[in-house]
């Protein structure tokens, strides 16, 4: 005999959970469902679109002899290594007879130290010949402040205060190394080091 | 904070009726699943019954299907469980207790439980 | 019906230790295992889920772990409120089953 009374609700009896952290973080979602009869395939949803290519497992069990007793499926998805492109609303969906069910929302977030998209390149500049240096990282959370160090001195008082994703050099007259800090709630990163060399006149 | 206050437990003999009620507040009742539980003397604990959000899906521990009757009513953030011929071996305390967002066949928040006896 | 097992009825400790409480199912349960705290005159209170997902407000010295059938609770950096019945519960389908619980005690 099945094991649940079956009604026009939600068959889902476990829900995707939420996850935030850095990238790279490795994290699974979950849905739970138990149905009467033949066990629907559970498709995934972030922001509303189904994910054709997710990475997702299911495990279905019969809970009785009868192929009309109640199944417990559980599917699985898999974070493997955590993007800004990952990071939405997730939702599982099946069709049961003539009915679509959508599971209640997990959400899926990126936080932690910023991260660099361009960071500061070795140069050779001739001798007192003005110059520039890009460095721009990224959060989440925003706001990201950079701060530039020569020498490992910082150019700034506070990061935010000095220059940003540009920093102008009107020249130097020995090799000196550049690096910048960004800074965000989460703490701190440190980009690699440029070696500038200065062309003797 | 969630808070789930569980009424209606006593002495009663072989074969009687007991209705228990857990009131909740401090979350959105009708958006979660609900179960009752209970343990015995011997601190073992034993899931009896749970109940989905809506009240529409109920699932009952084999020996208490057609004794006991698992309900909600959303309006009034209170959970029932309606026993009746009872036995001596109902005799434990009765938990109600919340089941987790992820899975409401896990338990996240439990009342601090009614005692049942059935005694002779 | 899964059947849980616990078997040690009694873990004895000493303040600062590890200890790994374990739990096995009659049946692989997808990680659908929780683990709850009990304290003399007190209910039970959810610790994890799903295996490793710790509940809200839990110390992270409280780690779940395993897979398949074999699941096990560890308590790092053991305290004294830490003294308590620790049961595990598969929460993969109905009827819900626990474990006779595991007391931890002092040394």
């Known amino acids: 005999a099945p094991r649940g009374t079956q009604a026009e609700e939600s068959p889902f009896v476990g829900n995707p959970g939420n996850i935030t952290g850095a990238r790279g973080l490795t994290g699974t979602l979950r849905c739970q469902l138990q149905v009467q009869g033949e066990p629907p395939e559970v498709h995934w949803l972030r922001d509303g679109q189904i994910l054709e290519l997710a990475d997702s497992t299911q495990t279905q069990v019969p809970l009785g002899e009868d192929e009309q007793d109640d199944w417990i499926v559980v599917s699985q998805l898999r974070i493997t290594s955590l993007q800004l492109s990952d990071t939405g609303q997730y939702q599982c969906l099946v069709f049961l007879g003539h009915q679509t069910f959508v599971s209640q929302p997990g959400y899926v977030g990126l936080e932690g130290l910023p991260y660099f998209l361009e960071e500061p390149e070795d140069r050779t500049v001739a001798a007192n010949t003005p110059f520039n240096l890009s460095c721009q990282a990224q959060g989440p959370p925003e706001p990201v402040d950079l701060l530039w160090l020569q020498d490992a001195v910082p150019l700034a008082t506070a990061p935010g205060h000095g220059p940003q994703r540009s920093l102008h050099v009107p020249g130097l007259n020995k090799t000196s190394s550049f690096s910048c800090e960004a800074h965000n709630a989460k703490g701190v990163t440190t980009s690699r080091t440029a070696t500038i060399t200065v062309l003797p006149q | 904070e969630v808070n789930l206050v569980e009424s209606g437990g006593g002495v009663v003999k072989p074969g009687a009726s007991l209705k228990l009620s857990c009131e909740a507040s401090g979350f959105t009742f009708s958006n979660y699943g609900m179960s009752w539980v209970r343990q015995t003397s011997d601190k073992r604990l034993e899931w009896v019954a749970s109940i989905s959000g809506g009240g529409g899906r109920t699932y009952y521990l084999d020996n208490v299907k057609g004794r006991f009757i698992i309900s909600r009513e959303n309006a009034k953030n209170t959970l029932y469980l309606q026993m009746s011929s009872l036995k001596s071996e109902d005799t434990a305390l009765f938990y109600c207790?919340?089941?987790?967002?992820?899975?409401?066949?896990?338990?996240?928040?439990w009342g601090q439980g009614s005692s049942v006896t059935v005694s002779s | 019906v899964i059947v849980m097992t616990q078997s040690h009825k009694f873990m004895s400790t000493s303040v600062g230790d590890r200890v790994s409480i374990t739990c096995k199912a009659s049946?692989?349960?997808?990680?659908?295992v929780a683990w709850y705290q009990q304290k003399p005159g007190q209910s039970p209170k959810l610790l994890i889920y799903?295996?490793?997902t710790r509940h809200t407000g839990v110390p992270d010295r409280f780690t779940g772990s395993g897979s398949g059938t074999d699941y096990s609770l560890t308590i790092s950096n053991v305290q004294t409120e830490d003294l308590a019945f620790y049961y595990c519960?598969?929460?993969?389908?109905?009827?819900?089953?626990f474990g006779a619980g595991t007391k931890l005690e002092l040394k």
């Open positions: 049946q692989d349960v997808t990680t659908a």
């Open positions: 207790a919340r089941g987790a967002r992820a899975s409401y066949f896990a338990m996240d928040y």
């Open positions: 519960q598969q929460h993969f389908t109905t009827p819900l089953t």
């Open positions: 799903w295996a490793s």
